[in-house]
Interface confidence: low
């Protein structure tokens, strides 16, 4: 049993042109979230199929709404870790699909919508209790960089998780052929339970249950001796109580490695020795060599030591991945400070300061008012990195330069109309109002609300508001 | 700071062993594989040895394999190749690597190397 652990990265338009456009929007905010679907093996098999090894969702990122006129960055991704329990053995070679689901915030009748934003897959081998394993993949215009890795759950170690771990029964070691459980060494390693009534000393297993036979017995619990009536056997007759054993095929007969390679045995298996140029189990995988210069943007090739890593690449600084393919994501740092945007131009970095900052890093905070005239007598704010201007009666807009209607506003009160006077403005209220506003009414006797009206004015004249 | 500094190179005569030292500073190597790559006059690098400390994995070029070992105390951060039945064709700059591993696919394991020391010189010779 174990946990196999997915870790996005980013998730972002691709390298190259057609930048994708953002899937969200000021009207339509949204959020990411990712689905995982294992299958064991190197499956062909549809992206329907049963997700046999496990599947997870994951949560759902923050809230997006993209910036007008900005390109459409990485979006913000989910917090954590999609994790797929296994319950049986990691099986080594696995498919994967990981989907990546946008959901939509609008207003939706029935709750959010979503929708498949990309979806990418993948055939690997991986061991569990390995490092973590980085990849990147593309869908479309989109770039998803990920991490993954299979952990074995206590007490299963080993590379398929298969092998056991228990509390030591002495303190000082382990019992006889049992090793330590690196990295836990208070802890042994539990005999495999092999399939019942297995002979210990004919038979041994490498996965619980099984029961398979040393050279010379045969039988389901390897009990058998392999013996003829006739002693042809190179090897020689044997004791007559085991007649003569004869070979079964040897594990190099027919000869197993591919592509010109030389097979030798070893106590349980084979070993192929590959020729140049090729790799594998078999020497069944052309790979690529040092000869073939893999290591892009001045990465240094070194020949893999492992019968199964072709080379290494020595990347320079800036760049990273298998094949120093991958330039370091500097701008992740957030080096741009006070909002500035961060562009990473390869031989540089450059940030996009916002209105009202500056510098390399847009560390200054500009004086927003410097050299900045409100027209008409109005006065400059400063605040939040942006200047406003506080504007005189009549005026406005950025830099007061406007006239501004005084009637835009409807101040004249029940009915009355306004009219546009240089110094202000004036209503001109309908029958039985007054007032500057003509928010008074006129008593039915004649007197009104107010004082007596100013001399030369009579009750439902033009009132001028100064 | 990734830091890597290597240490216990020497004049050894054929046939003699010596105990090389990586000692990592600025990361834990137990999130890594650490080798050893070695570079011989006149000849291109060549990656002697590998091991990842957080479950003992290693692997060895098939040059040292059965004289040189590779072992690791995450304890002191510290990754370490004791080369026995040392001969002349051993002679090269020892480097010190961070690996990092990216995986298994198209019939290989990927890695990188992206940090590495500035070297301990060995000598064999009689």
């Known amino acids: 049993a174990g946990v196999f652990e997915l870790q996005i990265h980013s998730f972002g338009p691709g390298p190259g042109p057609g930048a994708p456009r953002s899937p969200c929007s000021a009207r339509l905010p949204c959020r990411l979230f990712f689905r995982v679907c294992l299958k064991p093996g190197l499956s062909e098999e549809a992206a329907e199929s049963p997700c046999a090894l496990g599947a997870a969702l994951s949560a759902r990122g923050p809230v997006y709404t993209e910036q007008p006129g900005a390109p459409a960055p990485d979006l913000p991704l989910p917090d954590g870790l999609l994790q797929v329990p296994f319950r049986d053995a990691w099986p080594g070679t696995f498919s994967f699909i990981i989907e990546t689901w946008r959901e939509e915030l609008g207003d939706q009748i029935g709750g959010p919508a979503w929708s498949l934003l990309a979806r990418v897959a993948g055939r690997r081998r991986l061991a569990a209790g390995g490092p973590w394993a980085r990849d990147i993949q593309r869908a479309g215009a989109w770039e998803l960089r990920f991490s993954y890795r299979a952990r074995c759950e206590p007490p299963a170690v080993g590379t398929a998780c298969t092998r056991l771990c228990r509390p030591r029964s002495a303190p000082s070691r382990c019992g006889p052929g049992l090793r330590p459980c690196a990295p836990l060494e208070d802890e042994c390693e539990a005999p495999l339970v092999c399939r019942a009534g297995c002979s210990p000393e004919h038979g041994f297993c490498e996965q619980p249950g099984e029961c398979r036979c040393l050279e010379g017995w045969t039988g389901p619990l390897c009990t058998v001796p392999v013996s003829t009536s006739s002693c042809l056997s190179p090897r020689g007759p044997s004791s007559a109580t085991t007649g003569c054993l004869v070979p079964g095929p040897g594990p190099c007969d027919g000869n197993p490695c591919a592509n010109g390679g030389s097979c030798s045995e070893t106590p349980r298996s084979f070993e192929c020795t590959c020729p140049r140029g090729f790799y594998g189990l078999r020497c069944e995988v052309s790979g690529v060599t040092c000869a073939d210069g893999p290591c892009f943007n001045g990465g240094l090739c070194v020949g893999g030591a492992d019968p199964d890593s072709a080379y290494i690449c020595h990347c320079p600084p800036g760049f990273q991945g298998s094949n120093c393919e991958k330039r370091v994501d500097r701008c992740s740092l957030q080096p741009c400070r006070n909002g500035g945007l961060c562009l990473d131009l390869g031989h540089a970095l450059r940030c996009r300061c916002r209105a009202g900052f500056a510098g390399p890093r847009c560390e200054h905070d500009l004086d927003d008012c410097a050299g900045r005239a409100c027209a008409n007598g109005g006065t400059c704010v400063e605040g939040g990195g942006a200047h406003r201007c506080s504007c005189a009666l009549g005026f406005g807009g950025r830099d007061c330069r406007e006239r501004a209607d005084p009637c835009a506003a409807r101040p004249c009160a029940h009915g009355g109309r306004c009219y546009a006077h240089f110094s202000g403005l004036v209503c001109a209220c309908a029958p039985g109002y007054m007032g500057a506003r003509c928010e008074f009414p006129v008593h039915p006797d004649g007197a009104s609300a107010l004082p007596a009206a100013p001399p030369g004015l009579r009750p439902g004249d033009p009132q001028r508001y100064l | 700071e990734v830091q890597l500094v290597e240490s216990g190179g020497g004049l050894v005569q054929p046939g003699g062993s010596l105990r090389l030292s990586c000692a990592a500073s600025g990361f834990n190597i137990e999130h890594y594989s650490i080798g050893w790559v070695r570079r011989a006059p006149g000849k291109g690098e060549e990656l002697v040895a590998r091991?990842?400390?957080?479950?003992?994995?290693?692997r060895y070029a098939d040059s040292v394999k059965g004289r040189f070992t590779i072992s690791a105390d995450t304890s002191k951060n510290t990754a370490y190749l004791q080369m026995n039945s040392l001969r002349a064709e051993d002679t090269a700059v020892y480097y010190c690597?961070?690996?990092?591993?990216?995986?298994?696919?198209?019939?290989?394991?990927?890695?990188?190397?992206?940090?590495s020391g500035q070297g301990t010189l060995v000598t064999v010779s009689s």
């Open positions: 091991i990842y400390p957080t479950n003992g994995y290693t």
């Open positions: 690597a961070r690996h990092h591993y990216y995986g298994y696919h198209s019939g290989y394991h990927h890695y990188a190397i992206d940090y």
